[in-house]
């Protein structure tokens, strides 16, 4: 039986477990470019790392197919409610997949929030949005984070807004 | 080839997978001591457990180096905003690392919220803050949970405020 | 030594790692039946899948004992505050265990929120609740998601409200 007889396969299983793909990317001053693109991330400094995953223009890129728990947190904050924010635009935070098999990004995990009415008597408000879930990714597929109202994302020091994944 | 030739290493890999470090700690009446220290946790009763991780004065302590998904949820609640809370003090919930290599705790994952203005016509308000992310920890390093406004954390029954980790 | 000498066990370890239990279930129009039961989920279409876990009437069902990271997100939303909502009921979102060993469901992870006061000048409000944590489950035990105020859960396209688990 090929499945039971291959020492190399077992070794490979051990190796892959040893280096099971994982990544944690952190917010940085350059994360929000204001261009309507996805958020960009720090990949090496401080708490950020890539292990068995690649990075390209804001995207985590898989090197092997499998099920991944992907997650992102964004710190939201503002002074007052930008004209019409509470009325017109909830804040949408989402994780999206890019694949060569489709021309458009696919929604994976999405949240909407109406944050700026939260602080009763204050002009300053804070909110946080967390997303996490298991998705199947083929090798070479990409995952990005988007916040439509990206001017409300507080990036600062890398602990408040971040993006990561690991194989399950 | 040493990597492919070691039966013991393969067995060890299997054993370690079998008992991959994991923990889930729960809130209890004694969780908030009001001393400005980290939150304290139940480690054995009910849903709480430790597997391949230690516990000391509120901290999860690693016994082996690696990448860990660490998480915490705190249930926030109160009656009105006596602090002028929305104005003066957002609630800050964070996971912090203690290591012998640095004298001070290091921020790992942090959220800020302005919760107490949330309930429109109610004096009583509730909010919840979830944090989770992958960090690298050396053996013997510690992770703690802090909430600056710890009196606003509801700890009582163990399902609403908790703290955990597992190796990825 | 049986533990070190069993080729079959090693192979099984590889196989089980290859197919470590995992699932991600997504919201659908039929998720909320308005019957007071748990939320129901899509198990096959789109992003939904089951791998080494079963599904029955809203519940993820384990096929093997172990520690599982279980998670759920629900997208909440409404138009204004239904008469007395802020006054009457915070929104409670929870993960609960069903086991043949107890007649009643057991709370595992729970959040309460006061969402509908969040949008300051808007009749429309959005909020999102995320829960995740590690629990021990025996084979055949079930986990369900409940939101007491299920009419406020927005299910739509499967990316905003979901439920999943994986073995750690």
């Amino acid at each position: 039986d090929q499945d039971t007889g291959s020492w190399e396969q077992l070794v490979q299983a051990r190796r892959s477990h040893k280096a099971s793909p994982a990544a944690h990317l952190t917010g940085a001053n350059s994360s929000s470019m204001g261009t309507g693109g996805p958020l960009l991330w720090e990949t090496q400094l401080g708490l950020a790392f890539l292990r068995g995953l690649g990075y390209h223009d804001g995207a985590l890129v898989t090197t092997q197919a499998g099920y991944y728990y992907i997650y992102s947190k964004v710190q939201l904050g503002g002074v007052g409610c930008p004209q019409g924010l509470a009325t017109d635009l909830p804040v949408t935070h989402g994780l999206y997949k890019r694949t060569t098999r489709y021309p458009e990004e696919l929604e994976l995990l999405v949240s909407r929030r109406s944050p700026c009415g939260r602080a009763a008597s204050s002009r300053v408000w804070w909110d946080s949005s967390f997303l996490g879930g298991v998705v199947h990714l083929e090798a070479g597929e990409e995952v990005v984070v988007r916040v439509l109202e990206e001017q409300l994302v507080r990036l600062r020091d890398g602990t408040r807004s971040y993006f990561g994944a690991f194989m399950v | 080839d040493q990597d492919t030739g070691s039966w013991e290493q393969l067995v060890q890999a299997r054993r370690s997978h079998k008992a991959s470090p994991a923990a889930h700690l729960t809130g209890a009446n004694s969780s908030s001591m009001g001393t400005g220290g980290p939150l304290l946790w139940e480690t054995q009763l009910g849903l709480a457990f430790l597997r391949g991780l230690g516990y000391h004065d509120g901290a999860l302590v690693t016994t082996q180096a690696g990448y860990y998904y660490i998480y915490s949820k705190v249930q926030l609640g109160g009656v009105g905003c006596p602090q002028g809370l929305a104005t003066d003090l957002p609630v800050t919930h964070g996971l912090y690392k203690r290591t012998t290599r640095y004298p001070e705790e290091l921020e790992l994952l942090v959220s800020r919220r302005s919760p107490c203005g949330r309930a429109a016509s109610s004096r009583v308000w509730w909010d919840s803050s979830f944090l989770g992310g992958v960090v690298h920890l050396e053996a013997g390093e510690e992770v703690v949970v802090r909430v600056l406004e710890e009196q606003l954390v509801r700890l009582r029954d163990g399902t609403r405020s908790y703290f955990g980790a597992f190796m990825v | 030594d049986q533990d070190t000498g069993s080729w079959e066990q090693l192979v099984q370890a590889r196989r089980s790692h290859k197919a470590s239990p995992a699932a991600h279930l997504t919201g659908a129009n039929s998720s909320s039946m308005g019957t007071g039961g748990p939320l129901l989920w899509e198990t096959q279409l789109g992003l939904a899948f089951l791998r080494g876990l079963g599904y029955h009437d809203g519940a993820l069902v384990t096929t093997q004992a172990g520690y599982y990271y279980i998670y759920s997100k629900v997208q909440l939303g409404g138009v204004g505050c239904p008469q007395g909502l802020a006054t009457d009921l915070p929104v409670t979102h929870g993960l609960y265990k069903r086991t043949t060993r107890y007649p009643e469901e057991l709370e595992l992870l729970v959040s309460r929120r006061s969402p509908c006061g969040r949008a300051a000048s808007s009749r429309v409000w959005w909020d999102s609740s995320f829960l995740g944590g590690v629990v021990h489950l025996e084979a055949g035990e079930e986990v369900v998601v409940r939101v007491l105020e299920e009419q406020l859960v927005r299910l739509r396209d499967g990316t905003r409200s979901y439920f999943g688990a994986f073995m750690v």
Epitope: - | G84, S122, V124, L152, R154 | G84, T87, D88, L89
Partner: antibody, heavy 121, light 107 residues
């Protein structure tokens, strides 16, 4: 152990102003609490007058709002009540009470002994 | 304002009896209800908060239940010191309101 003690005149003339102070001992007024005033007319039930926090936030009973003022003196660790344009209907025992405003423990758990105020000419 | 209606307004019972007092809110208040005991010439004493949580130092003979609009205070076995007036209070929304009271007398 927090204790509360009301003080103020026991007799007030009609149309005058009722002024009471509640001294907080055994704890700080600058904690996550509401500091309340509740009154009880002779032989009747309890009526909430209003609350104040250490940061000066106030909430009053709408039935009394136009006549009530509450304030906090953090330096003296005390809070006070002023009720103007009083009538005989304001004759009551006046209590001050602490309400815990934290997540795990709500409720008015500490009360003063009460002070009787009579409105009469 | 939310109205709280207690029943009965008064009752007579004997030492050792099990007694139940109910409190109905005019609209839902979640679990934001407290129960107080008051003896003549004394301030109210907090017994139960959040509808069912026993205040520290209060005898476990007292218990509370309910959520939404209907609440109950139960005294499992009356003792001589339990004869007093009992009030429910909602603290969920402004203004804070109290029930009219239930007077518990010795039979």
């Amino acid at each position: 152990q927090v204790q509360l003690q009301e003080s103020g005149p026991g007799l007030v003339k009609p149309s005058g102003t009722l002024s009471l102070t509640c001294a907080v001992s055994g704890g700080s007024i600058s904690s996550i609490n509401w500091w309340n005033w509740v009154r009880q007319p002779p032989g009747k039930g309890l009526e909430w007058i209003g609350e104040v926090s250490h940061s000066g936030i106030t909430n009053y009973n709408p039935s009394l709002k136009s006549r009530v003022t509450m304030s906090v003196d953090k330096a003296k660790n005390q809070f006070s009540l002023k009720l103007n344009s009083v009538t005989a209907a304001d004759t009551a025992v006046y209590y001050c009470a602490r309400e815990r405003a934290v997540a795990d423990y709500h409720g008015m758990d500490v009360w003063g002994q009460g002070t009787t105020v009579t409105v009469s000419s | 304002a939310i109205q709280l209606t207690q029943s009965p307004s008064s009752l007579s019972a004997s030492v050792g009896d099990r007694v139940t007092i109910t409190c109905r809110a005019s609209q839902g208040i979640s679990s934001a209800l407290a129960w107080f005991q008051q003896k003549p010439g004394k301030p109210p004493k907090l017994l139960i908060f959040d509808a069912s949580d026993l205040e520290s130092g209060v005898s476990s003979r007292f218990s509370g239940s309910g959520s939404g609009t209907d609440f109950t205070l139960t005294i499992s076995s009356l003792q001589p010191g339990d004869f007093a007036t009992y009030y429910c209070q909602q603290f969920n929304s402004y203004p804070i309101t109290f029930g009219q009271g239930t007077r518990l007398e010795i039979k």
